[in-house]
C-alpha cells in the first residue's frame, strides 16, 4: 500500500495507526510534538520500507528506539528535504539509540541528529555505508561518546558478530544497537545492494532484495518501479511519479489536489507528471496536461477583491510576488522602510500590466519607481475623479519616473498627474508624456511647473571622464573639471561607485530615502589648483571585477526660473586588473593502485580572473614511525588519535583546562587562545544552528483552527 | 485531527435517490481532497468517488459512473454524494474520508476516516 503525500503524526501517540498499511509513504513522515510519554512497543509497522522524501522527529517524549516501530525501513530516498536533511533527529528526550537496522540507503540528502540528550549508538554507525557523502552530515549536542559504552553484539563474550569499517582513522565494529550489528554487503557486490545472505541483488535494487540478481524482488528501486519491475527509466507513454514510480496518463490526469491552483489538474511535462508547469513554462490551454515555454516571464494574474490595492509596506507588496497582471488599482503610499527599493522590486518587479489607475502619493522613502521594472501598460479601465489613471502627487523625494531610455510604458486611457515632487523635474515628466502616449490629454494644471523640481537640478550638463588607470584592486579616475556660471557655487563632487557585473545598471538603482543605496559615495574636494583635473583613487576593490562609476558635482547655482543647476556624468563601466586566485577548495587524494593518487578538487571561490591552468605539486612523505608502534594483533589495543574539530559543546568542559602537555617535559600549561578564524567558525557555527531551528519551528508549528 | 460524521444512509427501493452528508471539523476544509468510499457486507472496501479541494474535479469509480455525483461546500465544511438510480449492488456502508494535500488514484489509505453510515437498497 503506498500511503502520503506525506503524514505528519503530532499530538496523539494513537495517530500512529495511520502507518498500519503502509508499504511506501510517497511523501515525508513526521513524528513529533507527542509530549505524554507513552509506551510505544505495541506499536510496530513491518510493511514500512521506503519514505520517498524526508523522516522527521522531534520532541516525542517515551520513545527509546526507532527499530521496533520501523524494522524494515530500508530506504529514504530524500526527493525533496526537510532544509537539506532526509533524516531529522531532533529533541528527542527519551531516544537512546536510533535503531533502524534496516536503513540500508539515504538516497539524497544529509541526516542531521542534534539535541538529543540521552541518545548512543551514534559513533557506531558508518554513515559512509548509507549516504554518498558524509560531510554535510551535523550530528552534535547528542549524549557524549564517552558516557554511552556503546557496545556491539557479542563484543563482551569476544565473539564479535559485526563487522569493522573506518571512520576517522578509527577501525571498529559496526552496529545500531547492543543486538543489531549494520549491514554490509560483500565488496564483490561493489555498489549493489544483497540479500540477507549476502546475495547480490540486481543492479536496479536499491538497499535490498528478497533474490538474487532479479529485478522483481527488489526491496526498492534505484531508479524507478513499474508494474512490479524496477527499471532504469519510464517506458514508453508512462511518466515519473515523485522521483520514484512511472505512472500512465490517466492516473496522472486522475490525480486530485487540495491546493487553490487544483481547477486544471497535474501536467505532465519533460516525462514527468508534476502539479505544475515548471518555472519559466505554462500550460498550452487552461484545460491541457501539458506544458509550453513562456515568451519572457510566465503569467500570473493577481486580482483584489475591493479592487485597489494599497502597497503601504514590504508585506503589502509581498502579495504581488510573482503577478505579472494586476486586475485593479494600484495605491503607492510608502512614508518609510528599510532597503524599500530593493525589496518592492523583489515583489513587484514582474508587474507588467495594471488594468485599473496608478496612484503614488505622500511616498517619501521613494526615489525612483523603477522599482516597477516590468511595467509596460496602464490600462486605465477604472480611473480616477478628474479621469487620471496616472496620478503623482507629494512625494518629497522623489527623483526619477523610470529610465525613459530604456523603457517602453503606455497609459492606454486617461490622463496624468503632477504636483508637489519637489525633486522630480519638469523634463522628466514631460518626458513621460511623450514615451507614454498621453501628450495633448493633460489640461494646463495637470502637470505643476512651479512645485515640481523646484528642490532639484533640473538643468544638468555633462561631466566627462579623462583618464583611467586600473590595478587589481584600485581605480584611479579624473574628470574636466566643471566651471558653473559662478564658480563659487561648485562645492565638491560626489562620485558613486559598485559592483556591476552587466552594463545594465541606472543611477537609481536600490536607492531610496530612507539611506538605502546599492552605490558606495566617495566626496571628493575641489583641487586648490584651477589647473588641475579633479580625481579619485578608488581602493579596497575586488579583482577581475567591473565596476560601474559616475560623479555628480555638487553645486547651489540658481537659474533664472529658481531651478538648481548641475552637473554629472554618464555611467562608466570599468574593470579592475586580475590577481591571484584563492586557494582551490575541498582537496581530496585518494590511492587506487600502489602506484596511483587521484587527486580532486574544487575551484577557488575567488578566481580573481579567468582560470586557464592548475599546478598540482607532491612530494614524497616518510614512513610514520607510529604505524609500528602497536601489536596489531591484539584486541583493542589499536590507539585513538584525537583530532580537534573546531567545535565543542559547552556542557562537555568540565575538565581544568590547564591539562595539556607543551612538548618535552615542559609540564601543564594553557590551551592555546582561539584563532580569529576559530571564533569566526563557532560564531557562524552558533548562527546555522539557530537558522535551522526557526525553520524547524517554522514548518512545523501551526495555528490551531479556530 | 479531522473529525468527519457521515449522514444520510437508510432504507432505498432500487432506482431510488438518496443524498449523503458528511460533516467535517477539526481543520481547514478545503486543504483536504475528500473521498466516498463502501464496503459491501463479506467485501473489501472499495472506492466510489473523490474530489478536489476547490470542489473543481471530482473522479468516479467505473461502476458509479454517471448515477453519482460527488460535492462539497467549503463554507459549510460539508461533503455530499448525490446517488441516483440506486441499485441493489450499491448496498453497504459508505464512508467518508480525507487526505491532506491531494490524493492519487491508487491512494485507500487516506489520513482521516467517518464512522460509516449504510445505505441498503432493497424492494
Known amino acids: 500500500e503506498i500511503c502520503g503525500p506525506g503524514i505528519d503524526i503530532r499530538n496523539d501517540y494513537q495517530q500512529l495507526k495511520r502507518l498500519e498499511n503502509c508499504t511506501v509513504i510517497e511523501g515525508y513522515l513526521h513524528i513529533l510534538l507527542i509530549s505524554k510519554a507513552e509506551d510505544y512497543r505495541s506499536y510496530r509497522f513491518p510493511k514500512l520500507t521506503v519514505i520517498t522524501e524526508y523522516l522527521l522527529l522531534f520532541r516525542v517524549a517515551g520513545l527509546e528506539s526507532l527499530g521496533d516501530l520501523f524494522p524494515n525501513l530500508t530506504v529514504i530516498r530524500g526527493w525533496k528535504l526537510f532544509y537539506n536533511y532526509a533524516l531529522v533527529i531532533f529533541e528527542m528526550t527519551n531516544l537512546k539509540d536510533i535503531g533502524l537496522y534496516n536503513l540500508r540507503n539515504i538516497t539524497r540528502g544529509a541526516i542531521r541528529i542534534e539535541k538529543n540528550a540521552d541518545l548512543c549508538y551514534l559513533s557506531t554507525v558508518d554513515w559512509s555505508l548509507i549516504l554518498d557523502a558524509v560531510s554535510n552530515n551535523y550530528i552534535v549536542g547528542n549524549k557524549p561518546p564517552k558516557e554511552c559504552g556503546d557496545l556491539c553484539p557479542g563484543t563482551m563474550e569476544e565473539k564479535p558478530m559485526c563487522e569493522k569499517t573506518t571512520i576517522n582513522n578509527e577501525y571498529n565494529y559496526r552496529c545500531w544497537t547492543t543486538n543489531r550489528c549494520q549491514k554490509m554487503c560483500p565488496s564483490t557486490c561493489g555498489k549493489r545492494a544483497c540479500t540477507e545472505n549476502n546475495e547480490c541483488c540486481h543492479p536496479e535494487c536499491l538497499g535490498s532484495c528478497s533474490a538474487p540478481d532479479n529485478d522483481t524482488a527488489c526491496v526498492a528501486c534505484r531508479h524507478y518501479y513499474y508494474a512490479g519491475v524496477c527499471v532504469p527509466a519510464c517506458p514508453p507513454n508512462t511518466y515519473r511519479f515523485e522521483g520514484w514510480r512511472c505512472v500512465d496518463r490517466d492516473f496522472c490526469a486522475n490525480i486530485l489536489s487540495a491546493e487553490s491552483s487544483d481547477s486544471e489538474g497535474f501536467v505532465i511535462h519533460d516525462g514527468e507528471c508534476m502539479q505544475e508547469c515548471p518555472s519559466g513554462f505554462i500550460r498550452n490551454g487552461s484545460q491541457s496536461m501539458y506544458c509550453i515555454p513562456c515568451e519572457g516571464p510566465c503569467p500570473k494574474v493577481c486580482e483584489e477583491e475591493k479592487k485597489t490595492k494599497t502597497i503601504d509596506s514590504v508585506t503589502s507588496a509581498q502579495m504581488l510576488q510573482g503577478c505579472t497582471i494586476f486586475k485593479g488599482n494600484l495605491l503607492i503610499n510608502i512614508r518609510r522602510g528599510n532597503n524599500i527599493a530593493s525589496e518592492l522590486e523583489n515583489f513587484m518587479g514582474l508587474i507588467e500590466v495594471v488594468t485599473g489607475y496608478v496612484k503614488i502619493r505622500h511616498s517619501h522613502a521613494l526615489v525612483s519607481l523603477s522599482f516597477l521594472k516590468n511595467l509596460r501598460l496602464i490600462l486605465g479601465e477604472e480611473q480616477l475623479e478628474g479621469n487620471y489613471s496616472f496620478y503623482v502627487l507629494d512625494n518629497q523625494n522623489l527623483q526619477q519616473l523610470w529610465d525613459w531610455d530604456h523603457r517602453n510604458l503606455t497609459i492606454k486611457a486617461g490622463k496624468m498627474y503632477f504636483a508637489f515632487n519637489p525633486k522630480l523635474c519638469v523634463s522628466e515628466i514631460y518626458r513621460m508624456e511623450e514615451v507614454t502616449g498621453t501628450k495633448g490629454r493633460q489640461s494646463k494644471g495637470d502637470i505643476n511647473t512651479r512645485n515640481n523640481g523646484e528642490r532639484a537640478s533640473c538643468e544638468s550638463d555633462v561631466l566627462h571622464f579623462t583618464s583611467t588607470t586600473t590595478s587589481k584592486n584600485r581605480i584611479i579616475i579624473t574628470w574636466h573639471r566643471y566651471r558653473p556660471p559662478d564658480y563659487r557655487d561648485l562645492i565638491s563632487f560626489t562620485v558613486y561607485y559598485k559592483e556591476a557585473p552587466f552594463k545594465n545598471v541606472t543611477e537609481y538603482d536600490g536607492q531610496d530615502a530612507c539611506g538605502s543605496n546599492s552605490w558606495n559615495m566617495v566626496d571628493v574636494d575641489l583641487p586648490p589648483n584651477k589647473d588641475v583635473e579633479p580625481g579619485i583613487l578608488l581602493h579596497g576593490l575586488k579583482p577581475w571585477t567591473q565596476y560601474a562609476v559616475y560623479v555628480k558635482a555638487v553645486t547651489l547655482t540658481m537659474v533664472e526660473n529658481d531651478h538648481i543647476r548641475g552637473a554629472k556624468s554618464e555611467i562608466l563601466y570599468i574593470r579592475t586588473n586580475a590577481s591571484v586566485p584563492s586557494i582551490p577548495l575541498d582537496v581530496l587524494s585518494a590511492s587506487n593502485s600502489s602506484s596511483q593518487l587521484i587527486v580532486k578538487w574544487n575551484p577557488p571561490s575567488l578566481p580573481n580572473g579567468n582560470l586557464s591552468y592548475y599546478i598540482v605539486r607532491w612530494q614524497r612523505q616518510p614512513q610514520d614511525g607510529y604505524l609500528y608502534r602497536h601489536n596489531y594483533c591484539s584486541k583493542d589495543k589499536i590507539p585513538i588519535r584525537k583530532y580537534a574539530d573546531g567545535t565543542i559543546d559547552i556542557e562537555e568542559v568540565t575538565e581544568n583546562p590547564k591539562t595539556e602537555v607543551c612538548g618535552g617535559e615542559k609540564g601543564p600549561c594553557c590551551a592555546c587562545p582561539k584563532t580569529e578564524a576559530e571564533k569566526q567558525a563557532e560564531k557562524e557555527e552558533a548562527e546555522y544552528r539557530k537558522v535551522f531551528e526557526n525553520f524547524l519551528h517554522n514548518s512545523i508549528f501551526v495555528p490551531r483552527p479556530e | 485531527e479531522v473529525q468527519l460524521v457521515e449522514s444520510g444512509g437508510g432504507l432505498v427501493q432500487p432506482g431510488g435517490s438518496l443524498r449523503l452528508s458528511c460533516a467535517a471539523s477539526?481543520?481547514?476544509?478545503?486543504?483536504?481532497?475528500m473521498s466516498w468510499f463502501r464496503q459491501a457486507p463479506g467485501k473489501e472496501r472499495e472506492f466510489v468517488s473523490a474530489?478536489?479541494?476547490?470542489?473543481?474535479?471530482?473522479r468516479y469509480a467505473d461502476s458509479v459512473k454517471g448515477r453519482f455525483t460527488i460535492s462539497r461546500d467549503n463554507s459549510k465544511n460539508t461533503l455530499y454524494l448525490q446517488m441516483n438510480s440506486l441499485r441493489a449492488e450499491d448496498t453497504a456502508v459508505y464512508y467518508c474520508?480525507?487526505?491532506?494535500?491531494?490524493?492519487?488514484?491508487?491512494?485507500?489509505?487516506?489520513?482521516?476516516w467517518g464512522q460509516g453510515t449504510l445505505v441498503t437498497v432493497s424492494s
Open positions: 474520508a480525507a487526505n491532506p494535500r491531494r490524493a492519487t488514484p491508487d491512494l485507500t489509505q487516506y489520513a482521516y
Open positions: 474530489i478536489s479541494g476547490s470542489g473543481s474535479r471530482a
Open positions: 477539526g481543520r481547514t476544509f478545503s486543504s483536504f481532497v
